[in-house]
């Protein structure tokens, strides 16, 4: 999906109002220095591409993020403010229901969410630069 035509201001508002709080709650008990940020993004559409990938694509050591509250809110936000995004998710939703797994917060998942926080902050910064 090409995130170029999203309403970035509206996405930023949703992130600041609610998604950020859920990400921080997920990370509670860990320090910001516990993980190094290895994933970056260069512009707003690129940031959203990386955020989508890290949030919804299961990895061998962290398969359960898509069911977290911040992930559900991220999906809702993208579906709302990115034209045509919802139709790309119809089949993806069915596949996700089939592979539903037990929720386990592993260190790898914490690291992945730490990367997500970094990507979202980068998204906000690139937005501020444009303004």
């Amino acid at each position: 999906y090409d995130f170029t035509n999203c309403d970035f201001q509206k996405i930023e508002a949703d992130y600041l109002r609610t998604i950020s709080k859920d990400l921080i709650t997920y990370m509670s008990g860990t320090k910001s220095t516990d993980f190094n940020n290895t994933v970056s993004c260069s512009n707003r559409p690129h940031c959203l591409t990386e955020i989508q990938s890290l949030t919804f694509n299961p990895t061998p050591r962290c398969a359960s993020l898509a069911k977290e509250m911040f992930a559900r809110k991220t999906k809702a936000t993208l579906a709302l403010w990115c034209p045509g995004y919802s139709e790309t998710q119809i089949n993806a939703t069915q596949a996700m229901k089939k592979r539903r797994k037990r929720k386990v917060t592993t260190n790898k998942c914490l690291e992945q969410v730490s990367q997500l926080l970094g990507l979202w902050r980068r998204f906000i910064r690139t937005l501020l630069k444009k303004q």
């Epitope: 609610t18 999906k75 809702a76 936000t77 709302l80």
Partner: antibody
Amino acid sequence: EEKLQQSGDDLVRPGAAVKMSCKASGYIFTDYAMHWVKQRPGQGLEWIGTFIPLLDTSDYNQNFKGRATLTADKSSNTAYMELSRLTSEDSAVYYCARMGVTHSYVMDAWGQGASVTVSS
Amino acid sequence: DIVLTQSPATLSVTPGESVSLSCRASQPISISVHWFQQKSNESPRLLIKFASQSISGIPSRFSGSGSGTDFTLNINRVESEDFSVYYCQQTFSLPYTFGTGTKLELK
């Protein structure tokens, strides 16, 4: 079974405001946005706006911005629409309709409609 | 805003005939079009989602096709209960919009 129960019909004066409700049952309230649609007698469907309980956010058709206010009470699974500064043009049937925000993405259940008559 | 134009405005048919209703978008909207039926004094009812996907409980005589800007609702062998108004709707981008409607009436 998913159900949307709307409040009753209303007769209101021009310039006044009306607040209607839409009580949801049979599904997880926060998994869906609540949309509001206007239909004047013998006319088509006009999208007013939506409230997304999961995100506590709303969006409006420009034609209704500033006059329509969409809210929801998550504890009672009820969505509300308040329409202010009413004129005769607002005499219509108003529908609420749910739409999935993390799946489905379509208005698959509708309320029975609430008729508003604006008259002095 | 995306404008949806439906044609014809009115379609007069006899039961048993097959009909096609058209919905044209003012800009490409992929497959983000849904079809609703509205009978007199009733709420709209979802018939087809995302241009061609069927809905549970809807008779198989209703089908949809199209993508981009041109969409079609087909009714195979119209039955008496099908006489009503049909609307297309786009959810490609906000604000969501409805088509102008097509009234299917008895000839």
